[in-house]
């Protein structure tokens, strides 16, 4: 006569996080009298999941009605599965005994693996801006996924990048995993409108990868180019000098005019012209009353951009002999030029 056998037909079961896991177990006999219990893990540290005899197990339901006569099906369903539920589950038959029930026979075990979606990738850029031709690093992080196998790709404006390093932690077995990747990107002047994308593919995403993005506009600083020119005279005793500040990013810019090294006026750029590549242009005009000057004047346009060290461009304004003769008071008039395109 055959002794009771505990049959766990599935060696492994894979379930998506949030779903219910059904763990199957059947007995070949009603003998001996005693409860079945489900455990996660084996040995002294095993965790009780369900006890037919007693206890409250809110997440566990039995597939069959265990009070039904001649029931030999002791399968259970565990609700709201999380990665922490992963492990090997054993269906164990106990024999009624005093003072305690005695373990009689165990099933072979069913390994429960939990498929957990990775979190939305978070892409972060450098703490400080860098200028074109320099290399900046972007990091991408995602957490809480299982199983460990995962694919991460980097793109810049749709073009796949190759200079990156990726780590999946921890290296050993875990209920869930995290991925961390660092990509190195060489900046170009046209990168204000550029975007880097971190793309993650995982079995739980069913071919629809997750993407995290970062704008290079947060990482780049394009320093301005300066050009100081004299415009045609409006009047005999006035000179019109312009400072064209071109192709800079970001917006933050302060311009100072100096006459022979002395500060004439400081202004902050407000209404800017945006170029197609995302950089900005700005023009400042200075009207110089030439009759107020006996000697030639060196006009300097000094620009402080995005908190960086100032750059400047000078222009020597020649005062004609006629103007020098008539010059008296050292007064000058300067007018802000309206914003105008190049």
């Amino acid at each position: 006569e055959d002794e009771l056998q505990v049959i766990q037909p599935e060696k492994s079961v894979s379930v998506a996080a949030g779903e219910s896991a059904t763990l199957r177990c059947a007995m070949t006999s009603l003998i001996p009298v005693g409860p079945i219990m489900w455990f996660r893990g084996a040995g002294a540290g095993r965790e009780l999941i369900y006890n037919q005899k007693e206890g409250h197990f809110p997440r566990v339901t039995t597939v069959s009605e265990l009070t039904k006569r001649n029931n030999l099906d002791f399968s259970i369903s565990i609700s709201n599965i999380t990665p922490a539920d992963a492990g090997t589950y054993y269906c164990v038959k106990f024999r009624k005994g005093s003072p305690d029930d005695v373990e009689f026979k165990s099933g072979a075990g069913t390994e429960l693996s939990v498929r957990a979606k990775p979190s939305a990738p978070v892409v972060s850029g450098p703490a400080v801006r860098a200028t074109p031709e320099h290399t900046v690093s972007f990091t991408c992080e995602s957490h809480g996924f299982s199983p460990r196998d995962i694919t991460l790709k980097w793109f810049k404006n749709g073009n796949e990048l190759s200079d990156f390093q990726t780590n999946v932690d921890p290296a050993g077995d875990s209920v869930s995993y995290s991925i961390h990747s660092t990509a190195r990107v060489v900046l170009t002047r046209g990168d204000v409108h550029s975007q880097v994308i971190c793309e993650i593919a995982h079995i739980t995403l069913q071919g629809d990868p997750l993407r995290g993005t970062a704008n290079l506009s947060e990482a780049i600083r394009v320093p301005p180019t300066l050009e100081v020119t004299q415009q045609p005279m409006r009047a005999e005793n006035q000179a019109n000098v312009t400072c064209q500040v071109s192709n800079f990013y970001p917006r933050g810019l302060q311009l100072t005019w100096l006459e022979n090294g002395n500060v004439s006026r400081t202004e902050t750029a407000s209404t800017l012209i945006e170029n197609k590549d995302g950089t900005y242009n700005w023009m400042s005009w200075l009207l110089v009353n030439t009759c107020a000057h006996r000697d030639d004047v060196v006009l300097t346009c000094q620009v402080e951009h995005d908190g960086q060290q100032a750059v400047s461009k000078s222009y020597a304004l020649e005062i004609s002999a006629h103007q020098k003769e008539h010059g008296s008071d050292i007064t000058h008039e300067a007018a802000l030029a309206p914003t105008a395109p190049l």
């Epitope: 006569e1 070949t28 006999s29 009603l30 003998i31 001996p32 009298v33 030999l72 009624k96 005994g97």
Partner: antibody, heavy 115, light 111 residues
Framework: RQLVESGGGLVQPGGSLRLSCAAS????????ISWVRQAPGKGLEYIGT?????ITYYASWAKGRFTGSKTSSTAYLQMTSLRAEDTAVYYC????????????WGQGTLVTVSS | DIVMTQSPSSLSASVGDRVTITCQAS????????LAWYQQKPGQAPKLLIY???TLATGVPSRFSGSGSGTDFTLTISSLQPEDFATYYC???????????FGQGTKVEIK
């Protein structure tokens, strides 16, 4: 589905008797067979349960004198050193108690121990 | 060994009456629910009514119900029928697999 007992009868004190319990309509392989007796005009008394070869157990008063065995179709109760107080109707029932209650019963067989 | 005490030992009732029989165990039964109720009519084998304290056996009319846990259990017949006049036994199981004991029985007679 039924259980049919046989083997009862008159036996002298100190004698032995083997009762049989034949199952029809189901196999005994996955079920325990329990034996219960009822003395004339008295209540029910549990004797023991025959599971498999390694799983048989008896009420404390029945140990030593009563032994059971079974095949897939028939269960047996061997009784020795019979006494007058063993006179009763002997029932076999399918089940082992708790979640495997005694759901099918034989019609009973009378054992009379008398000289 | 576990001792099962039934009360009353007998009772008289009429058809349609609600009948309650109690069974008390000398210690908590196994799993707090190893308690079955059987009905026996003269000259017949017992018949299973209730097991696991409150589970109705297949084919048993719903007027029979069981309740209780631990040491105190009750069999209730909500509306006594002519065929219900019989003797009722509880069977309790202790922690040892061989420790199964019947109560002394309750005879339900026609008033």
């Amino acid at each position: 589905r039924q259980l049919v007992e046989s083997g009862g009868g008159l036996v002298q004190p100190g004698g032995s008797l083997r009762l049989s319990c034949a199952a029809s309509g189901f196999s005994l392989s996955s079920h325990g067979i329990s034996w219960v007796r009822q003395a004339p005009g008295k209540g029910l008394e549990y004797i023991g349960t025959i599971g498999t070869g390694v799983i048989t157990y008896y009420a404390s008063w029945a140990k030593g004198r009563f032994t059971g065995s079974k095949t897939s179709s028939t269960a047996y109760l061997q009784m020795t050193s019979l006494r007058a107080e063993d006179t009763a109707v002997y029932y076999c029932a399918r089940g082992s108690a708790w979640n495997d209650p005694f759901d099918y019963w034989g019609q009973g067989t009378l054992v009379t121990v008398s000289s | 060994d576990i001792v099962m005490t039934q009360s009353p030992s007998s009772l008289s009732a009429s058809v349609g009456d609600r009948v309650t029989i109690t069974c008390q165990a000398s210690q908590s039964v196994y799993g707090n629910n190893d308690l079955a109720w059987y009905q026996q009519k003269p000259g017949q084998a017992p018949k299973l009514l209730i097991y696991l304290a409150s589970t109705l056996a297949t084919g048993v009319p719903s007027r029979f119900s069981g309740s209780g846990s631990g040491t105190d259990f009750t069999l209730t017949i909500s509306s006594l029928q002519p065929e219900d006049f019989a003797t009722y036994y509880c069977l309790g199981g202790g922690d040892d697999e061989a420790d199964n004991t019947f109560g002394q029985g309750t005879k339900v007679e026609i008033k």
